[in-house]
């Protein structure tokens, strides 16, 4: 599947367009807002019914090199006590990001964008229950 | 720009960080993985911080759709199914890439852009402290 | 240090109408929400309204839905709580809650007193 084209329904594609070789397109992996700061929650990760750790994935023929994947570190979820509770669950909430992929195929290099799927957290739900007979 | 393990045999001139900017192939490796929230899990439901999710859409963005999620509560749902307000539903936030079509229209020219989006929440116990 | 500074309590007759504000100061940066509890003698403190900061979405008990208001004003990080047909069970302390997600601070609570 591939990107969708600019719909004719919202505009006209404009003449200032770069050219661009058939099957590809051109990609300025400069990115905008690389520089903003997230005021992310201090310890959310920490603090959390359902905490969770971190780990850093890299891979030097993708960009960004460094992808951060969240593990939730119980299957339970933590009481008020501070105890685990195992009748409620520790579930990943997800989301779809996107990378570009450098392959090597003898000395040519081609750029593929990809996919990938991070874990952001954790959150804690309640399980829905089958009796199997 | 990222350093790349480069073949030995392969002539010097070759740049070992990625360059500004590269064409790249219109198909998306694992495009086909299902981007609706909603249908991959009910987890939005069933959970002790549950959210609702908001469709966010512009046509100059790939994907043009990302689902926004806002906490359906400030406390969390207890046992009896009651929001207890001494526990908090705190967003769980990440900066994800997409592509932003540049010039603005064009069908096969984007820059990646880095944008924050809410994804689910989470139940925190916050740390209290009694202002004096 | 975060500071909290509640004003508007004091005594009213059943029917009446009063609005309490608090006044956050300090660090008081990444608000998640902000809002009221209160608290009886003997009683455990409850929570009354809150006002979460993104996006000034509110929520009450349903003791004062229809009667009470939260308001906020991003600009001086204030909160306002607008009391109408106050009833003589409204009597309690009332304290200021300010929510930064993992860490809360509440306020040293203003007394409201309804009575004939």
């Known amino acids: 599947r591939k990107i969708p084209k600019v719909g004719h329904t919202f505009f006209q594609k404009p003449e200032s367009c770069p050219p661009v070789p058939g099957g590809s397109m051109k990609l300025d992996i400069g990115i905008i807002n690389e520089n903003q700061r997230v005021s992310m929650s201090r310890n959310i990760e920490s603090r959390s019914t359902s905490p969770w750790n971190y780990t850093v994935t890299w891979d030097p023929n993708r960009y960004p090199s460094e992808v951060v994947q969240a593990q939730c570190r119980n299957l339970g979820c933590i009481n008020a006590q501070g105890k685990e509770d195992i009748s409620m669950n520790s579930v990943p909430i997800q989301q779809e990001t996107l990378v570009v992929r450098r392959k090597h195929q003898g000395c040519s290099v081609s750029f593929q964008l990809e996919k990938v799927l991070v874990t952001v957290g954790c959150t804690c739900v309640t399980p829905v229950i089958h009796h199997v007979q | 720009g990222i350093t790349i393990p480069r073949n030995p045999g392969c002539p010097n001139s070759e740049d070992k960080n990625f360059p500004r900017t590269v064409m790249v192939n219109l198909n998306i490796h694992n495009r086909n993985t299902n981007t609706n929230p909603k249908r991959s899990s009910d987890y939005y439901n069933r959970s002790t911080s549950p959210w609702n999710l908001h469709r966010n859409e512009d046509p100059e963005r790939y994907p043009s759709v990302i689902w926004e999620a806002k906490c359906r509560h400030l406390g969390c749902i207890n046992a009896d199914g009651n929001v207890d307000y001494h526990m908090n539903s705190v967003p769980i936030q990440q900066e994800i890439l997409v592509l932003r079509r540049e010039p603005p229209h064009c069908p096969n020219s984007f820059r990646l852009e880095k944008i924050l989006v809410s994804v689910g929440c989470t139940c925190v116990t916050p740390i209290v402290h009694h202002v004096a | 240090e975060v500071q909290l500074v509640e004003s508007g309590g004091g005594s009213v007759q059943p029917g009446d109408s009063l609005r309490l504000s608090c006044a956050a100061s300090g660090r008081a940066n990444s608000i998640n929400w902000f809002g009221w509890f209160r608290q009886t003698p003997g009683k455990e403190r409850e929570f009354v309204a809150g006002?979460?900061?993104?996006?000034?979405?509110?929520e009450y008990a349903n003791s004062v839905k229809g009667r009470f208001t939260i308001s906020r004003d991003n600009s001086k990080n204030t909160v306002d709580l607008q009391m109408n047909s106050l009833r003589p069970e409204d009597t309690a302390v009332y304290y200021c809650?300010?929510?930064?997600?993992?860490?809360?601070?509440w306020g040293q609570g203003t007394l409201v007193t309804v009575s004939s």
């Open positions: 006002i979460r900061w993104s996006d000034a979405y509110t």
């Open positions: 809650v300010l929510d930064l997600s993992t860490v809360r601070y």
